[in-house]
Interface confidence: low
């Protein structure tokens, strides 16, 4: 009988820059044979495709078979429970995943001190699994922006500051001397994605840094 | 040179308000960044909110919702209105702002909480908030 297992409660995306993740929720009660099958469905081309028969956890990493979701209409995916001959009812995600669902990250923040100043570079990210011609400037070719907060050590002070339109920066600390630490949050400006907040990166300043001039 | 002249403390009750304006004279048309800072008895000063020559603001996480910074840049002059005002936030407030140009051309000037960012003070006006 097909439809005697319950249906995962709900099915999502969690996407970064070519980290494309489908999420679902367990049935419940499900049993140690209870296992879960993924299908695609893109856009244009009305017809599911089987991506996993049986997957044991409640996540599937689909980066491999959206990897034209930057150039395309975007997917659905549907999962549904299996337990031997027994399976549920699909459930499909309630959203399109298109290039909007994408969480914007960067790949690292570079800092270093000149003469006074910090000078901080964006690292955009490099996934492997991206192909060569599709990086993120390519893809966010316009309008690519970044928030920078900044937090003073010793102090636990942090200041959000404007948005800067360039994968480079500076921060003036002419006199003072410390631990800086700067976080950057991406976004492009013509767009809704959503953002992260990238890992705090650390600089520590101390005199030796400033030149003196007459 | 720049000039810079706070006005509109005074004494106000807790979840009162006040407008604070700063009144900038002289060399105006440089300035990048400026900002309000406050500095109460035995401690720091300390910023409050900074505005851009863009419109950018930013605001202490102790303020924010509560105080807006703008400018009126036909006037030359800078506020702050204070709303829900607390017993904490009695300080000599300080108007300040900033002509200098760092960095390149391919660098975004950032207006800061810190003080060594800004060359030009005004004189203060105090704000006292009682419960």
């Known amino acids: 009988h097909g439809t005697e297992l319950p249906s995962p409660p709900s099915v999502w995306f969690e996407a970064e820059f070519f980290h494309h993740i489908l999420h679902w929720t367990p049935i419940p009660n499900q049993s140690e044979s209870t296992c879960y099958e993924v299908a695609l469905l893109r856009y244009g081309i009305e017809s599911w495709n089987s991506i996993s028969n049986c997957s044991q956890t409640l996540s599937y990493d689909l980066t491999a078979v959206t990897l034209d979701l930057y150039h395309s209409n975007g997917y659905r995916a549907r999962v549904r429970a299996v337990d031997g001959s027994r399976h549920s009812n699909w459930t499909v995600t309630n959203t399109r995943f298109s290039v909007d669902e994408v969480t914007l990250t960067v790949g690292s923040v570079n800092l270093e001190i000149h003469n006074g100043f910090i000078l901080g570079k964006i690292q955009l990210p490099r996934p492997k699994m991206a192909p060569a011609n599709d990086t993120y400037e390519s893809i966010f070719s316009h309008f690519r922006e970044y928030e920078i907060a900044i937090r003073k050590v010793p102090g636990n002070f942090t200041f959000t500051h404007k948005k800067v339109k360039h994968e480079n920066f500076s921060l003036l600390t002419s006199g003072e001397v410390g631990e800086f630490c700067v976080q950057v949050k991406p976004s492009v400006a013509s767009r809704s994605n959503k953002g992260m907040w990238s890992k705090e990166e650390c600089i520590s300043l101390t005199r030796q840094y400033f030149t003196v001039t007459n | 040179q720049v000039q810079l002249q706070e006005s509109g403390g005074g004494s106000v009750q807790a979840g009162g308000s006040l407008r604070l304006s700063c009144a900038a004279s002289g060399y105006t048309y440089s300035m990048y960044c400026m900002g309000w800072f406050r500095q109460a008895p035995g401690k720091e000063r300390e910023g409050v909110a900074q505005?851009?020559?863009?419109?950018?603001?930013s605001y202490a996480d102790s303020v924010k919702g509560r105080f807006t910074i703008s400018k009126d840049n036909a006037k030359n002059t800078l506020y702050l209105q204070m709303n829900s005002l607390k017993p904490e936030d009695t300080a000599m407030y300080y108007c300040?702002?900033?002509?200098?140009?760092?960095?390149?051309?391919?660098?975004?000037?950032?207006?800061?909480?810190?003080?060594?960012?800004?060359?030009?003070w005004g004189q203060g006006t105090q704000v006292t908030v009682s419960s």
């Open positions: 300040a702002a900033d002509s200098r140009v760092y960095g390149g051309s391919w660098y975004e000037r950032l207006c800061g909480p810190y003080t060594y960012e800004y060359n030009y």
């Open positions: 505005i851009n020559s863009d419109g950018s603001t």
